[in-house]
Amino acid sequence: RAVPGGSSPAWTQCQQLSQKLCTLAWSAHPLVGHMDLREEGDEETTNDVPHIQCGDGCDPQGLRDNSQFCLQRIHQGLIFYEKLLGSDIFTGEPSLLPDSPVGQLHASLLGLSQLLQPEGHHWETQQIPSLSPSQPWQRLLLRFKILRSLQAFVAVAARVFAHGAATLSP
């Protein structure tokens, strides 16, 4: 078990699941990669979702010194995105297509966050109320932006776990 505040993570297992997350995130919205959504937002909105940043200890040196800081950051982000994908932003109208990978993506986020969960702590998933946009086109745009930022987040997480599996596994 990977454990913010505990022992060493199952790096290889985390690597495999994070790799799967990358694939799912891109298949959930493959066109997302062709647009720069920073144009849509501004300096303020870039803070809205969790990012893995320089001070989070996710660099090779930081992981070697104490991987818990980085793992905690990844854990927080996974939980945030897992809740987001389970919220009315994604469950409301317009309905997702039956074969949409968002459901799988949601489940995989939950799976990886549970791998990174401290022993004896059980995260309860719940439907979170939110001020979801009233217009379907606004909701679609919001989904698009969320998936774009999730792609960036899981790409960094996958690199972290790949490095951990290669250099930090027992």
Epitope: G41, D42, E44, T45, N47, D48, V49, P50, Q76, F80, K83, L84, S87, I89, I128, P129, S130, L131, S132, P133, Q138, L142, K145, I146, S149
Partner: nanobody, 118 residues
């Protein structure tokens, strides 16, 4: 429906401090951002600072290092600690809520007056 109630405004001398509070009720979640805005007489309303559900903060240039935005543990009240106040900080301060990744704020409070005298 969301209700926002601001308090803590008043008259203060330049260099002084004030702490504004914004009490939010209704369906606020971690997918919302709460921002403090201000409007000085004859000027457009501007964003001062904002805070997300995961406690990431944003400040406009003119208040960086002087103002601090924070929230209580229950995440229902947001504070704006204003230090080293200047006469140009005089304005009506409004609390507002928006959805993450959207620039438009959806719900607004009534505002609280802050006057900084020289």
């Amino acid at each position: 429906e969301v209700q926002l109630v601001e308090s803590g405004g008043g008259l203060v001398q330049a260099g002084g401090s004030l702490r504004l509070s914004c009490a939010a009720s209704g369906s606020i979640s971690e997918f919302n951002v709460i921002g403090w805005h201000r409007q000085a007489p004859g000027k457009e309303r501007e964003l001062v600072a904002s805070i997300t559900g995961h406690d990431s903060t944003y400040y406009t240039g003119s208040v960086k290092g002087r103002f601090t935005i924070s929230r209580d543990n229950a995440k229902t009240t947001v504070y704006l600690q204003m230090n080293s106040l200047k006469p140009e900080d005089t304005a009506v301060y409004y609390c507002a809520v928006r959805q993450i990744l959207r620039r438009e704020y959806d719900y607004w409070g009534q505002g609280t007056q802050v006057t900084v005298s020289s």
